[in-house]
Amino acid sequence: KLTIESTPFNVAEGKEVLLLVHNLPQHLFGYSWYKGERVDGNRQIIGYVIGTQQATPGPAYSGREIIYPNASLLIQNIIQNDTGFYTLHVIKSDLVNEEATGQFRVYPELPKPSISSNNSKPVEDKDAVAFTCEPETQDATYLWWVNNQSLPVSPRLQLSNGNRTLTLFNVTRNDSASYKCETQNPVSARRSDSVILNVLYGPDTPTISPSDTYYRPGANLSLSCYAASNPPAQYSWLINGTFQQSTQELFIPNITVNNSGSYTCHANNSVTGCNRTTVKTIIVTELSPVVAKPQIKASKTTVTGDKDSVNLTCSTNDTGISIRWFFKNQSLPSSERMKLSQGNITLSINPVKREDAGTYWCEVFNPISKNQSDPIMLNVNYNALPQENLINVDEQLYFQGGSGLNDIFEAQKIEWHEARAHHHHHH
């Protein structure tokens, strides 16, 4: 059967298309091409007589068509109007006619798009921005790219106008990015240049650094203030409520106790019209900036449970310090049997119980610094326990609480030779 194949089917304006004829019959007199789905003399493009090899243009001939001896038709410099159907009319030597129709679609070669914006300086959490991909092109698909990636899913992003317009509601600083649009049709794809969205924001609450509060007399006080802001914030400093200077850094050499007080950093963004402040307390004191490592002294380190008491003393040569105690990573005192005295220097446990066995340490600190002692181990022994409270694990004797104590006493080895000998005597 006579058929027409369009190569290609989707043709770009300005390019060419070949209407390729398949299964052309033998013994032909000639053939004619027509624009449309039927033979119509008024729409004849070109006729060809095989015997004379003569091509004759018809009313629909534009000078862009070339007919080949195999009846295929080449159309050059395609225009939008060329879209549609084409009919080949074959006249055989026996004057019997045969027809076939083919078609193709014409699309414009897309121009490079550009992005227009309705707001070049949007303010964070306040403004919306609408980007539009120009120009509007029929039969084109519009795509958007943010930092060269496809659009993220967000309730603040909305596509409209056939995806030609991208709207960002309540812009945030995170929307500051590179935006591109792309136009696509079956014959071409073009991407715009980047448009950088510049979201105005801030200032955020300023941060004053360094974070130190305490300084020694004679030191230099150097404070820096920073607040995230676009455009960058303007800074000013106040000390105890009195304006000092309009700079991001504040420097006071050789400070004295008189420089103690509240230091305020004020950050202002003149474009967004917003301002924020942060207040920092500075204390100038003679207190030692380095606290020495304390030591623990114990009245005894091995005691008998429910009988003995013990005193632990945290020794330090520093003055103006505070002391706190720790046992098994918890601060003390943790029971009524524990008492702190002499400004927390001494920890007394009276009487000592089996649960008091373990590691103790103290920490000395002042507002500027702190230091910890090495730990000390307190061992707690018990006399004459009943046989059923002993268990043998790898030939080591451990105490197992009875009458109300459900858990094995935490890996606290009992130095109890008499009970051990008694245990082995019975096994």
Epitope: E16, Y48, P57, S62, G63, R64, L74, Q76, N77
Partner: nanobody, 119 residues
């Protein structure tokens, strides 16, 4: 009605020059490709040169490269062939034709103009 009318042929001595013109009607030459085809007795038909105004492209047969120049004036809907350094083997009837930019195939031409190169 589509028409191609050639002019400018004549007798010229070897080494001489001629300029052929092809006036087109019934279509715009800016939309298509126009070529010059020559036929000489006992020789194969030859596509000498063509021009596609819409593409801004030109092509030449090896035998005329550097000697012939094809051009088009779309405002006059006319194509030209400037022939320099003519040789005896350039003697032929020159036809203006509508040609394919793809493969140089042509299938509609004018009545032709005769160029004779002889001393």
């Amino acid at each position: 009605e589509v028409q191609l009318v050639e002019s400018g042929g004549g007798l010229v001595q070897p080494g001489g020059s001629l300029r052929l013109s092809c006036a087109a009607s019934g279509f715009n030459i800016k939309d298509t490709c126009i070529g010059w085809v020559r036929r000489a007795p006992g020789k194969e038909e030859e596509l000498v040169a063509d021009i596609c105004p819409y593409k801004g492209s030109t092509r030449y047969a090896d035998s005329v490269k550097g000697r012939f120049t094809i051009s088009a004036d779309t405002s006059k809907n006319t194509a030209y062939l400037q022939m320099n350094s003519l040789r005896a083997e350039d003697t032929a009837v020159y036809y203006c034709a509508i040609v394919s930019a793809r493969d140089g195939y042509y299938n509609y031409w004018g009545q032709g103009t005769t160029v004779t190169v002889s001393s």
